[in-house]
């Protein structure tokens, strides 16, 4: 790793190291020789999940019911909302941005693995 000018949880600005804002807070103003970094908590439905120097918090993900989504875990100031799919559907991507109906096994095939919230049914030919 290349050398860094600052400690962990600091950043370099105007040739000085300033403290990063803790998760759940955003940067209002950089530190100076005489003042510390100024941070403010994220607002309702916003979050920042790392030590940061962001001036804006990120919006929580919206679990769109029209896409078959529902809230699995409510977001906090330090974490994003986690979406999952409604009963009978599974996520189509790692980030679960949309859902698809579980695939039924066609005649001549049996269920080898049941579908879950994140995986589709795995079918297997009958012997």
């Amino acid at each position: 790793e290349p050398p860094t000018a600052c400690r962990e949880k600091q950043y370099l600005i105007n040739s000085q190291c300033c403290s990063l804002c803790q998760p759940g807070q955003k940067l209002v103003s950089d530190c100076t020789e005489f003042t510390e970094t100024e941070c403010l908590p994220c607002g309702e439905s916003e979050f920042l999940d790392t030590w940061n120097r962001e001036t804006h918090c990120h919006q929580h993900k919206y679990c769109d019911p029209n896409l078959g989504l529902r809230v699995q875990q409510k977001g906090t100031a330090e974490s994003d909302t986690v979406c999952t799919c409604k009963e009978g559907q599974h996520c189509t991507s790692k980030d679960c941005e949309a859902c698809a109906q579980h695939t039924p096994c066609i005649p001549g095939f049996g269920v080898m693995e049941m579908a879950t919230e994140t995986t589709d049914t795995v079918c297997h030919p009958c012997p």
Epitope: T4, C6, R7, E8, Q10, S15, Q16, C18, T35, E36
Partner: antibody, heavy 126, light 107 residues
Framework: QVQLVQSGAEVKKPGASVKVSCKAS????????MHWVRQAPGQGLEWMGW????????NYAQKFQGRVTMTRDTSISTAYMELNRLRSDDTAVYYC???????????????????WGQGTLVTVSS | DIQMTQSPSSVSASVGDRVTITCRAS??????LAWYQQKPGKAPNLLIY???TLQSGVPSRFSGSGSGTDFTLTISSLQPEDFATYYC?????????FGGGTKVEIK
């Protein structure tokens, strides 16, 4: 009371490696960065880098990048500095030095060394 | 890297003298500066940090001043135990850098 006790003197051949230990006592080992500073005979002080014993994170001076490795064993409150591919100009006294407490610093890196090990003389000679 | 230049490199003085050592940084370091005393065969000893704060247990005859690029260590009345080498160190950004040292010798 705070103490940093280093391993004994070493004589090494050029191209070899040396590993110096620094055992801390009298304070919470994981609460303070540990730095390594060396001093060649009759010369000034030269900073080598730091390790955060809590996270294991390190930061090495460019000059030693790729040749130095700083590690720690929190179970025995000991920091280590390994220097590889030794040359004759690596002959020096190597010191570990304790920094200010984690979270103390808000502006600047404010790394001031209030406690030092007794030093370990490493002689590199063929 | 920030270069730290100390002057003089050596000074001859007598017990009771006032001794001043200067340290100049190649770029502004605010007040992030420390002074150490080192005696032969020993590890350095922290005297002053943040340019002017006296480390606990250090005699009040030692004082520090300055900010930005120019700093001073003053020993108001030199004592026999003060004959040693003194180093400044910037603590603004990594890599930490030290001055070349000032040896205070007996006149």
């Amino acid at each position: 009371q705070v103490q940093l006790v280093q391993s004994g003197a070493e004589v090494k051949k050029p191209g070899a490696s040396v590993k110096v230990s620094c055992k801390a006592s009298g304070y919470t080992f994981t609460g303070y960065y540990m730095h390594w500073v060396r001093q060649a005979p009759g010369q000034g002080l030269e900073w080598m880098g730091w390790i955060n014993p809590d996270s294991g994170g390190t930061n090495y001076a460019q000059k030693f990048q790729g040749r130095v490795t700083m590690t720690r064993d929190t179970s025995i409150s000991t920091a280590y500095m390994e220097l590889n591919r030794l040359r004759s100009d690596d002959t020096a006294v190597y010191y570990c030095a304790r920094d200010q407490p984690l979270g103390y610093c808000t502006n600047g890196v404010c790394s001031y060394f209030d406690y030092w090990g007794q030093g370990t003389l490493v002689t590199v000679s063929s | 890297d920030i270069q730290m230049t100390q002057s003089p490199s050596s000074v001859s003085a007598s017990v009771g003298d006032r001794v001043t050592i200067t340290c100049r940084a190649s770029q502004g370091i605010y007040s992030w500066l420390a002074w150490y005393q080192q005696k032969p065969g020993k590890a350095p000893n922290l005297l002053i940090y943040t340019a002017s704060t006296l480390q606990s247990g250090v005699p009040s005859r030692f004082s520090g001043s300055g900010s930005g690029t120019d700093f001073t260590l003053t020993i108001s009345s030199l004592q026999p135990e003060d004959f040693a080498t003194y180093y400044c160190q910037q603590a603004n950004i990594f890599p930490l850098t030290f001055g070349g040292g000032t040896k205070v010798e007996i006149k």
